[in-house]
Every structure is written in structure tokens, then in C-alpha cells.
Amino acid sequence: MNGRVDYLVTEEEINLTRGPSGLGFNIVGGTDQQYVSNDSGIYVSRIKENGAAALDGRLQEGDKILSVNGQDLKNLLHQDAVDLFRNAGYAVSLRVQHRLQVQNGPIGHRGEGDPSG
């Protein structure tokens, strides 16, 4: 019997300081570039090695960015989202959604990491 794949969704506020080469990541998404089906949100597609985001360590590829400095990223064109990050200033506050894949074991069996075992 196959295990079921679930997702644990968490939100986090990440404060980044713009480095010499910027914030150090790439994005996909927007109302004109739906990367995820039926979702025009903005997602992190690449973290630049040794960039500000990589050195901070909390932002991950696949994270959805909900807001920048309190400004909602809903219903934005892709290029407008890029511009928003570029013009966000030196100290940048990101509200992000992490989506962690959780692999459950077959029904009736405890997973290896189940603390109740």
C-alpha cells in the first residue's frame, strides 16, 4: 500500500538586508505567468549562491512570497512583481509561505519518525 503525501504549510516573516549584489534570488509567477495551476502567486525559483537570501538561509526554492514590506503580491503582473523587489529598499521584509512535503506511512503503520512509538 502506498503512503499518502501531505503538505505542511507554514508562514514566516523574513527580514533581509540587501547585499552588494542585491537580494539574491529569482521569482516566477504573476497573473500573466501562472507557474502553479490556478495560482497567480509569486514563487521563489532560484536562490543565488552566497547572495543575501542564501546567507540568511531561511528563504527556500518553492516558497511563495505573500508580501514585500507589507505590500500584498496578489494579482500582480510578473514584471510588476520584479519591479517591486528591485525598488524595495535596503531592508526588505518578506512574508513567505513554506510548503513542506510530509510523507505518511501506509495506514496502520507508524512512520519511523513518529514520536509516539
Epitope: 549584489s21 534570488f25 543565488k48 520584479v82
Partner: nanobody, 125 residues
Framework: EVQLVESGGGLVQAGGSLRLSCAAS????????LGWFRQAPGKEREFVGA??????STADSVKGRFTISRDNAKNTVYLQMNSLKPEDTAVYYC?????????????????????WGQGTQVTVS
């Protein structure tokens, strides 16, 4: 994993034209930032130009002579090279990164790209 394959290089006389192609794998090709770089013998890799979701740009050394375009239906990016000069002789590389950089509209640093083709030789006599 993104794979890039360049083609179209060759030997051309000064003043002539060539069109390089770079075919890419991946279902989200339209979101890629794609760059063209070149490397002449004994020299560092040089930025030629890039194309993103919203536009393209070329380096000052080739501006007005080279243009970059893409065909998302064919997963291919092109480098049209006109008025070629002997100093354009180099191996030309296609590079890709998924998504758009939030730091640079047209990234010119090779470190901004994760995937590279094998290169195609252009010789201008």
C-alpha cells in the same frame, strides 16, 4: 534538469551574418531567463546579451549588430548576429536560469545562470 544545445556556428567572412540557436528542455521554458555569452581563446567569458519574460538586452560591444529573440512554442532562443567582425570570433554559449532575477533585469554575471550549453564555435575571417 534543464539541458541546452546550441547550433548555428561556423566560419563567416567579416561583414556577414549568422543566427545561433539554443534549444532547451523543460515545460516552463517561457519563465527562463536566457543569456548568451562568448569566450575567445585566452580571454574571460563575456556577456553578449539576455532575454527575459519581458524583454531583451545586448552588451554595448554588440549593440545594433546582435539581437536576441525567443520562440516559446519551440523552446528555443536565438542570437542573430549581423555585421560580424574578426573580434567576434569566439565560442558562444547559451545559459539559463529559472525565473527572473529580482536584482538585475538582464543578468550579465555568469553566476546568475545555473545551466549551460556546450558552446558553438563562431569564426569571423
Amino acid at each position: 534538469e534543464v539541458q541546452l544545445v546550441e547550433s548555428g556556428g561556423g566560419l563567416v567572412q567579416a561583414g556577414g551574418s549568422l543566427r545561433l540557436s539554443c534549444a532547451a528542455s523543460g515545460r516552463t521554458f517561457s519563465t527562463y531567463t536566457l543569456g548568451w555569452f562568448r569566450q575567445a581563446p585566452g580571454k574571460e567569458r563575456e556577456f553578449v546579451g539576455a532575454i527575459t519574460w519581458s524583454g531583451s538586452s545586448t552588451a554595448d560591444s554588440v549593440k545594433g549588430r546582435f539581437t536576441i529573440s525567443r520562440d516559446n512554442a519551440k523552446n528555443t532562443v536565438y542570437l542573430q548576429m549581423n555585421s560580424l567582425k574578426p573580434e567576434d570570433t569566439a565560442v558562444y554559449y547559451c545559459a539559463a536560469a529559472i525565473g527572473s532575477s529580482v536584482d538585475s533585469y538582464y543578468p550579465s554575471d555568469p553566476l546568475e545562470y545555473d545551466y549551460w550549453g556546450q558552446g558553438t564555435q563562431v569564426t569571423v575571417s
